[in-house]
């Protein structure tokens, strides 16, 4: 199984290393998740030709995946630390149902899919500690999530492959934008 950040052999071998700051820990956690996504994408791309499809073609989907927009305060123009942090946490919470969908979608990378899901939960906890304005964070409705999950799982094979690919790509892009913004905070 993939080893979570802070538990690799290098860390064990260097007990006198300075403990990671909150920001460093978040940075490392996101990079760990990105590595996991990369491994999952490898399996997906080997299995189907979705990865060759153009971004424009893939944009024509009815998935409501979280995406960074200018108004979210995470880009340089209009950068706003608090607004951005709320968007990152809200977006990650919204991705959780899609990460649940990814479970059982992988044959050789089953553990990796679980690791991405669990690491994201940990990341959300790290970020919630960093956020001052937790009241502004809306948690997705569990009933809505349950029916969405059922709907996604009822799709035909081709659509499930497409959905898997889109979730991985969108989650990667969301994490990249999030981490770039967090590196400015």
């Amino acid at each position: 199984a993939p080893v979570p950040p802070g538990e690799d052999s290098k860390d064990v071998a260097a007990p006198h290393r300075q403990p990671l700051t909150s920001s460093e820990r978040i940075d490392k956690q996101i990079r760990y998740i990105l590595d996991g996504i990369s491994a999952l994408r490898k399996e997906t791309c080997n299995k189907s030709n979705m990865c060759e499809s153009s971004k424009e073609a893939l944009a024509e989907n009815n998935l409501n995946l979280p995406k960074m927009a200018e108004k979210d305060g995470c880009f340089q123009s209009g950068f706003n630390e608090e607004t951005c942090l709320v968007k990152i946490i809200t977006g990650l919470l919204e991705f959780e149902v899609y990460l649940e969908y990814l479970q059982n979608r992988f044959e050789s990378s089953e553990e990796q899919a679980r690791a991405v899901q669990m690491s994201t939960k940990v990341l959300i906890q790290f970020l919630q500690k960093k956020a001052k304005n937790l009241d502004a964070i809306t948690t997705p409705d569990p009933t809505t999530n349950a029916s969405l999950l059922t709907k996604l799982q009822a799709q035909n094979q081709w659509l499930q492959d497409m959905t898997t690919h889109l979730i991985l790509r969108s989650f990667k892009e969301f994490l990249q934008s999030s981490l770039r913004a967090l590196r400015q905070m």
Partner: nanobody, 124 residues
Framework: EVQLVESGGGLVQPGGSLQLSCTTS????????VGWFRQAPGKEREFVAD????????WYAHSVLGRFTISRDDAKNTVYLQMDSLKPEDTAVYYC?????????????????WGQGTQVTVSS
């Protein structure tokens, strides 16, 4: 790691323009974020601009904001730094760097590959 090669540097008058290029033969270069840094004689290396795997995610140092533009052409495995309204204080060796996570950032530690640099001199 990817091998990076910068080009396009030279001598230019104040107010002039230059376009720097950062190229690699790396197959997955489109997945990397690329940053430009610069180092003037006797000074620390400093962040100039970066571009994420998603080309719309660009950041600039305040000193170059509005004058420099970073862009990428993934078909050519190249990232460009268009430098306009150049000032004598822009004189430096310019380095490009790549981040395999596609994120980038304003600190050198975020990057895992570096080019050798290209000299830019702004003088009349």
């Amino acid at each position: 790691e990817v091998q990076l090669v910068e080009s396009g540097g030279g001598l230019v008058q104040p107010g002039g323009s230059l376009q720097l290029s950062c190229t690699t033969s790396g197959r997955r270069f489109s997945e990397y974020a690329v940053g430009w840094f610069r180092q003037a004689p006797g000074k620390e290396r400093e962040f100039v601009a970066d571009i994420g795997e998603q080309a719309e995610n660009t950041w600039y140092a305040h000193s170059v904001l509005g004058r420099f533009t970073i862009s990428r052409d993934d078909a050519k495995n190249t990232v460009y730094l268009q430098m306009d309204s150049l000032k004598p204080e822009d004189t430096a060796v310019y380095y490009c760097a790549a981040d395999k996570y596609g994120v980038g950032g304003n600190a050198q530690g975020y990057y895992d590959s570096w080019g050798q640099g290209t000299q830019v001199t702004v003088s009349s």
